[in-house]
């Protein structure tokens, strides 16, 4: 999906008002020095591409993020503010239902959510190179 035509300001507002708080809740008890951000993004469409990948695609050691509250709210925000996004996700959602696993918060998941917080941070404040 190409995130170029999303309403970035509406997504940002949704992130600040709810999604960010759910991410903080998920990370509660984790030290702020624990994880270094290794995933980066250069502009808002790129940040949303990375956010979608990290939120909804299962990875080794962390298969369960898509069912977390922050993930469901992220999906809703993208569906509302990115034209045509929900249609592209129907097949992905059906595939996800087939491989549903029980929720387990692993250290790998905590690291992944820390990366997500970093991506959202750059989505909110892209530091464009000065000409």
């Amino acid at each position: 999906y190409d995130f170029t035509n999303c309403d970035f300001e509406k997504i940002k507002a949704a992130y600040l008002s709810t999604i960010s708080k759910d991410l903080i809740t998920y990370m509660s008890g984790t030290k702020s020095t624990e994880f270094n951000n290794t995933v980066s993004c250069s502009n808002r469409p790129h940040c949303l591409t990375e956010i979608q990948s990290l939120t909804f695609n299962p990875t080794a050691g962390c298969a369960s993020l898509a069912k977390e509250m922050f993930a469901m709210k992220t999906k809703a925000a993208l569906a509302i503010w990115c034209p045509g996004y929900s249609e592209t996700q129907i097949n992905a959602t059906q595939a996800m239902k087939k491989r549903r696993k029980r929720k387990v918060t692993t250290n790998k998941c905590l690291e992944q959510v820390s990366q997500l917080q970093g991506l959202w941070r750059r989505f909110n404040r892209p530091l464009l190179k000065q000409q």
Epitope: L16, S17, I24, N36, R121, L127
Partner: antibody, heavy 119, light 107 residues
Framework: QVQLQQSGAEVKKPGASVKVSCKAS????????IEWVRQAPGQGLEWMGV????????YYSQKFQGRVTMTADKSTSTAYMELSSLRSEDSAVYFC????????????WGQGTTLTVSS | DIQMTQSPSSLSASVGDRVTITCRAS??????LVWYQQKPGKAPQLLIY???NLQSGVPSRFSGSGSGTQFTLTISSLQPEDFATYYC?????????FGTGTKLEIK
């Protein structure tokens, strides 16, 4: 807990340069932008620029372009702001500030470094 | 660059009063506005981000509203520790700029 510890007060002559340090602790230094803000005596806050400590990318206010250099030393978790060709109007308190978890504000500030430029 | 204008520049009020400070942006900044409180000799402290979100640990008597170009900070019932200078700042795009400040004094 998060702390930004700045270097001490400086007195400089017009035309000289000053380098202010901001040592960060209590968080992952390279994950957050560091901004520099100054405040002249009895005046408001003035944004100077920002650095990404991970990449070294900077963005300076046009007002300070050519006179300011912001750097970061990842090994010591310290950000630096150097201002050259000083003039009396540069006398101010200089603050470093860390961007918040959400990237939508500054949540922690240094205590400020007072610079006096006088002949 | 986006210009931020605050009004009033100074304000006298009493403990218990309801106070409103306004911030105007020279162009649409959506909800990308922050409010800070600063006391003499100290660094600013974050109150509100994203125009209406209360920073953790900030008393609920502080609230923010507005979007686009017009924003307000409201203190519902002034406490003695609230007498300070308040600044808005846009967080829309680099370069960021601050408002002109509003000094809140005891009547």
């Amino acid at each position: 807990q998060v702390q930004l510890q700045q270097s001490g007060a400086e007195v400089k002559k017009p035309g000289a340069s000053v380098k202010v340090s901001c040592k960060a602790s209590g968080y992952a230094f390279t994950n957050y932008l560091i901004e520099w803000v100054r405040q002249a005596p009895g005046q408001g806050l003035e944004w100077m620029g920002v650095i990404n400590p991970e990449s070294g990318d900077t963005y300076y206010s046009q007002k300070f372009q050519g006179r300011v250099t912001m750097t970061a030393d990842k090994s010591t978790s310290t950000a630096y702001m150097e201002l050259s060709s000083l003039r009396s109007e540069d006398s101010a308190v200089y603050f470093c500030a860390k961007e918040s978890l959400t990237g939508s504000s500054y949540d922690y500030w240094g205590q400020g470094t007072t610079l006096t430029v006088s002949s | 660059d986006i210009q931020m204008t605050q009004s009033p520049s100074s304000l006298s009020a009493s403990v218990g009063d309801r106070v409103t400070i306004t911030c105007r942006a020279s162009e649409n900044i959506y909800s990308n506005l922050v409010w800070y409180q600063q006391k003499p000799g100290k660094a600013p402290q974050l109150l509100i981000y994203g125009a209406r979100n209360l920073q953790s640990g900030v008393p609920s008597r502080f609230s923010g509203s507005g979007s686009g170009t017009q924003f307000t900070l409201t203190i519902s019932s002034l406490q003695p520790e609230d007498f300070a200078t308040y600044y808005c700042q846009h967080f829309y795009e680099t370069p960021l700029t601050f408002g002109t400040g509003t000094k809140l004094e005891i009547k």
